[in-house]
């Protein structure tokens, strides 16, 4: 063996966004024949020497960052990428609206606005079926997610969450769904958005930081965070993954 053992993967099934009191399973997957797995919760002394962490009912205290590694003989692997386990439903749901409206012509512009009655400074928007979330720090209890030059691929069901940067793994319940309808096109690009939105004066600081990635990572000008919605595994009690967008840091 030359060099360190390759890192394992760490998944949350059915999703890394877990409503309070609902079950979730964290699964560490290394190569065949691993001697020992270690799964740990970062920023705590909590760990276990097995590949699977079963959480029958999600609690606030279980939200946070997790990683795992494995041992073969006397060698330890590199750690897995961190998995951010988020408890949702901790706070009341925000409201999501579309300006000027949820029906938009292809090529037009629309802005999705997430609004909460709490003084949260963080918002997350997701579209069902997409690979990563937008996260958005805001000062005015409302986040704007402009979509410039709308295409058919932007059609779909959106929801948003609100939360505080002080407790970044404790999120609100999801907003009621907003159905965005794009009219006047028959071409459906395979990825979306087709370009990052351009800054809008009212929210220039936040929107300028938006970069959409089609991996499981979301990059901003300041930090990189990974919020992973786990894919389905056929032999697991998991369901179809819901993927998320975040914006900002």
């Amino acid at each position: 063996q030359s060099g360190p053992l390759p890192k394992p993967s760490l998944q949350a099934l059915p999703s890394s966004l877990v409503p309070l009191e609902k079950p979730v399973t964290l699964r560490c997957q290394g190569p065949p024949g691993v001697d020992l797995y270690r799964l740990e919760k970062l920023s705590s002394s909590r760990y276990q020497d097995q590949a699977v962490l079963f959480i029958p009912a999600m609690k606030r205290s279980l939200a946070g960052r997790y990683r795992c590694s494995y041992q073969n003989g006397s060698l330890w692997s590199l750690p897995s990428d961190q998995l951010e386990l988020v408890a949702t439903g901790v706070f009341a749901k925000p409201s999501l609206s579309a300006q000027p409206g949820p029906a938009v012509s292809s090529g037009g512009d629309v802005t999705l606005q997430c609004q909460t009655r709490y003084g949260f400074d963080q918002f997350a928007l997701y579209k069902e079926g997409d690979p990563a979330p937008y996260k958005n720090p805001e000062r005015w209890y409302r986040a704007s997610f402009p979509i410039i030059t709308v295409t058919a691929a932007h059609s779909g069901t959106y929801r948003c969450y609100s939360f505080s940067s002080r407790d970044p793994y404790l999120w609100s319940a999801p907003s009621d769904p907003l159905e965005l309808v794009v009219t006047g096109t028959s071409v459906t690009p395979s990825r979306l958005p087709t370009e990052p939105p351009s800054p809008v004066a009212e929210f220039s600081e936040a929107t300028a930081e938006l970069t959409v990635s089609f991996t499981n990572e979301v990059f901003t000008t300041e930090t990189s965070r990974s919020i992973t919605a786990s894919p389905k595994e056929s032999d697991s009690p998991a369901g179809p993954a819901r993927q998320y967008y975040t914006k900002g840091n």
Partner: antibody, heavy 119, light 107 residues
Framework: VTLKESGPGILQPSQTLSLTCSFS??????????VGWIRQPSGKGLEWLAH???????YYNTALKSRLTISKDTSNNQVFLKIASVDTADTATYYC????????????WGQGTTLTVSS | DIQMTQSPASLSASVGETVTITCRAS??????LAWYQQKQGKSPHLLVY???NLADGVPSRFSGSGSGTQFSLKINSLQPEDFGSYYC?????????FGGGTKLEIK
């Protein structure tokens, strides 16, 4: 894996029902294992009552929570359920069953014990 | 609480036929669903776990499908021992609830 329920058979209204589930072939100290209680009035459907996990976390049927208490004796391979202040609506067959986290299912069931509440 | 709606409530079929029983959850339960068979006077018996996985010893003529809110149990080429009652149950957060049951009778 086997489970067997035992209970009083007959109770009068307002009495407390004490049920015992004795099991073999698995341990309730094993990670991811639980035992649950389910009941079925004659000719009717199944109703989940409560369950307890290996780590002593307990969950109860919302409508009956104030009357239910589940507990375990890991060393003797037993799980207990108490139902306070029974009435005729509690007349049913009571089952215990093993829960395994991976399958998220009740994978082994006892034969059941029948309770009749009558004055 | 999550409600499980099972249909039909009763079903008559002949040996050799194929039947399908459905179960609908009132909200997304991913694949946290099990199916059980119960014969008269006996305790329930696990058939399918995690919506699609056959329990040990269950004949391959049984199959489970679905995820999210819509699920089904299919029995191909019914055998005499298949007649009885069938129940679905969700495990996606307590309270765990059962469907109302489907009574499968010989035609």
């Amino acid at each position: 894996v086997t489970l067997k329920e035992s209970g009083p058979g007959i109770l009068q209204p307002s009495q407390t029902l004490s049920l015992t589930c004795s099991f073999s072939g698995f341990s309730l100290s094993t990670y991811g294992i639980g035992v649950g209680w389910i009941r079925q009035p004659s000719g009717k459907g199944l109703e989940w009552l409560a369950h307890i996990w290996w780590d002593d976390n307990k969950y109860y049927n919302t409508a009956l929570k104030s009357r239910l208490t589940i507990s375990k004796d890991t060393s003797n391979n037993q799980v207990f359920l108490k139902i306070a202040s029974v009435d005729t609506a509690d007349t049913a067959t009571y089952y215990c069953a093993r829960i395994h986290y991976y399958g998220s299912s009740l994978d082994y069931w006892g034969q059941g014990t029948t309770l009749t509440v009558s004055s | 609480d999550i409600q499980m709606t099972q249909s039909p409530a009763s079903l008559s079929a002949s040996v050799g036929e194929t039947v399908t029983i459905t179960c609908r959850a009132s909200e997304n339960i991913y694949s946290y669903l099990a199916w059980y068979q119960q014969k008269q006077g006996k305790s329930p018996h696990l058939l399918v776990y995690a919506a699609t996985n056959l329990a040990d010893g269950v004949p391959s003529r049984f199959s489970g499908s679905g995820s999210g809110t819509q699920f089904s149990l299919k029995i191909n080429s019914l055998q005499p021992e298949d007649f009885g009652s069938y129940y679905c149950q969700h495990f996606y957060g307590t309270p765990w609830t059962f469907g109302g049951g489907t009574k499968l009778e010989i035609k």
